[in-house]
Amino acid sequence: EAHKSEIAHRYNDLGEQHFKGLVLIAFSQYLQKCSYDEHAKLVQEVTDFAKTCVADESAANCDKSLHTLFGDKLCAIPNLRENYGELADCCTKQEPERNECFLQHKDDNPSLPPFERPEAEAMCTSFKENPTTFMGHYLHEVARRHPYFYAPELLYYAEQYNEILTQCCAEADKESCLTPKLDGVKEKALVSSVRQRMKCSSMQKFGERAFKAWAVARLSQTFPNADFAEITKLATDLTKVNKECCHGDLLECADDRAELAKYMCENQATISSKLQTCCDKPLLKKAHCLSEVEHDTMPADLPAIAADFVEDQEVCKNYAEAKDVFLGTFLYEYSRRHPDYSVSLLLRLAKKYEATLEKCCAEANPPACYGTVLAEFQPLVEEPKNLVKTNCDLYEKLGEYGFQNAILVRYTQKAPQVSTPTLVEAARNLGRVGTKCCTLPEDQRLPCVEDYLSAILNRVCLLHEKTPVSEHVTKCCSGSLVERRPCFSALTVDETYVPKEFKAETFTFHSDICTLPEKEKQIKKQTALAELVKHKPKATAEQLKTVMDDFAQFLDTCCKAADKDTCFSTEGPNLVTRCKDALA
């Protein structure tokens, strides 16, 4: 139903705390360089204005759209052009073009320093002094670094953060209580960020239909007892929610997500037997819980998929009558039978089925033509299964760091033109798939591995889009989202690449490396590894292992030496010489 004042409506629905959090996230995601204080001031002004509209919906400007209200606020910021360059040109446009312009200027890789966590005592002091400001800083810092972070989910992570601090700041040993818990939240939030970015990419590049197909497959796997109409309803609503968040309509998105959670909890009987635990929780926890609820038990009496989609004499008639519905029912039926497949694989199978019907239904004898379609799925299914087996075996053999290095070598060979920091970030993220997925039960590995890899490769594509350097990467990133991972997996050494000349300074290290945290040390070593591969793209695994072992030994020796600086300056050049010889 239409409301006189959209801003009053959303304020009333969401409540002041969530309203303010979402407005702060929205501003931080649009203007990523502004300080927390600048955004906090705007948020307060917007909130005060919303309250006047709640009191009187007919008050001046209360009837304006949220885009107009928020855009006007952003465009009133002083020195916009100096700080943001051409983004200021957006302010010369009218809505809805102005908002589209803001969206186009979101930066997936802003030049902001890494978000450093203060030490425990300092954190607890500032948290106790002003919990609201502390959490506001958290929302601001995460949102500006992740401009597509799913806003209602970021509120959930902030709530988690709050609970951890409340608990740990009361303990004697704050550090050992906080560190593992906050690391856990950070890891989950980072995965949530790349997954949501993938959803927004799907929406932006291929439209709502593509996202809805993803949602149908995912929901059918999770709720195999819900009927097709129910799954389609949920997918339609979920598509709306995600479209709003990806489009910067964060208040509408959070409000509609709460509505969807409410609907699911009121209709558990027709959706799933596994929802009750989630539905007993408060709003943010409930919606988060529903988004990762365990799969319901599959119905025992499901007929073979072939009955309706291959053997039925009316396949072509049914397809012609309503293509989207027929393909939707195929995707639904196949997905509910295969919780052990990745969504990407299910969408590839549905695409194959559609292509087969398009071809066969135009022929003289369609059943003879599409009769073998299910057998033709086999290679499509085997390929990711082999990928999972090979990679999980390698992960179990090498451990996470070694597995990351193996991936780093592989991907540097595939796309040596890509910048070393991007390759290292990608390999570290891709390598985490082992820890995340390879320890799971067999039937959960494939969906975990492939859907996670797809999300990470989407980030690779986004970063590469800004500065395209590799034809290999451009080729894989230009196709459909579901074909990206197989495309990257199939890439081999780039034969067109002219190796980088050997520069001694790239492999020169100083004693400051010794005091770095383990993660930073690893990144330094992995940076050197990528540079080695760029110098010798066809170096064997043995050669690279020899060099890296030597490098690790050198660091170990010099970091234990009494005079570290002398050790680094004398042993460093020897290491460089040995490296060159080993790779010659």
Partner: nanobody, 117 residues
Framework: EVQLLESGGGLVQPGGSLRLSCAAS????????MGWVRQAPGKGLEWVSL????????YYADSVKGRFTISRDNSKNTLYLQMNSLRAEDTAVYYC??????????WGQGTLVTVSS
């Protein structure tokens, strides 16, 4: 027994509008997805739209998107189809139908819509 009774059809000029209604009885209307299907003279069936019990629209045929709007009033056990910007190719018998799990299981008698100048 399940009964579906369509009304609202008739002759309309191109660019004009019509609103079809379907009165349902004999089943718990607000538990079922409902839809409209049409059959043009000498042609096969074409699905037009589907609506979930909650009122969420879950399907429009590409040929009617942006022109037709499906809706329902569960308190009145009635399904509607608002048809705007009608074209000659929309001429057909329009059937109201009840969806059950994976297909339509009950149909009305149909109402004829003729778009002609």
């Amino acid at each position: 027994e399940v009964q579906l009774l369509e009304s609202g059809g008739g002759l309309v000029q191109p660019g004009g509008s019509l609103r079809l209604s379907c009165a349902a009885s004999g089943f718990t209307f607000n538990h079922y997805t409902m839809g409209w299907v049409r059959q043009a003279p000498g042609k096969g069936l074409e699905w037009v739209s589907l609506i979930h019990p909650s009122g969420t629209v879950i399907y429009y045929a590409d040929s009617v998107k942006g022109r037709f709007t499906i809706s329902r009033d569960n308190s009145k056990n009635t399904l509607y189809l608002q048809m705007n910007s009608l074209r000659a190719e929309d001429t057909a018998v329009y059937y109201c139908a009840k969806w059950s799990s994976r297909a339509f299981d009950y149909w009305g008698q149909g109402t004829l819509v003729t778009v002609s100048s």
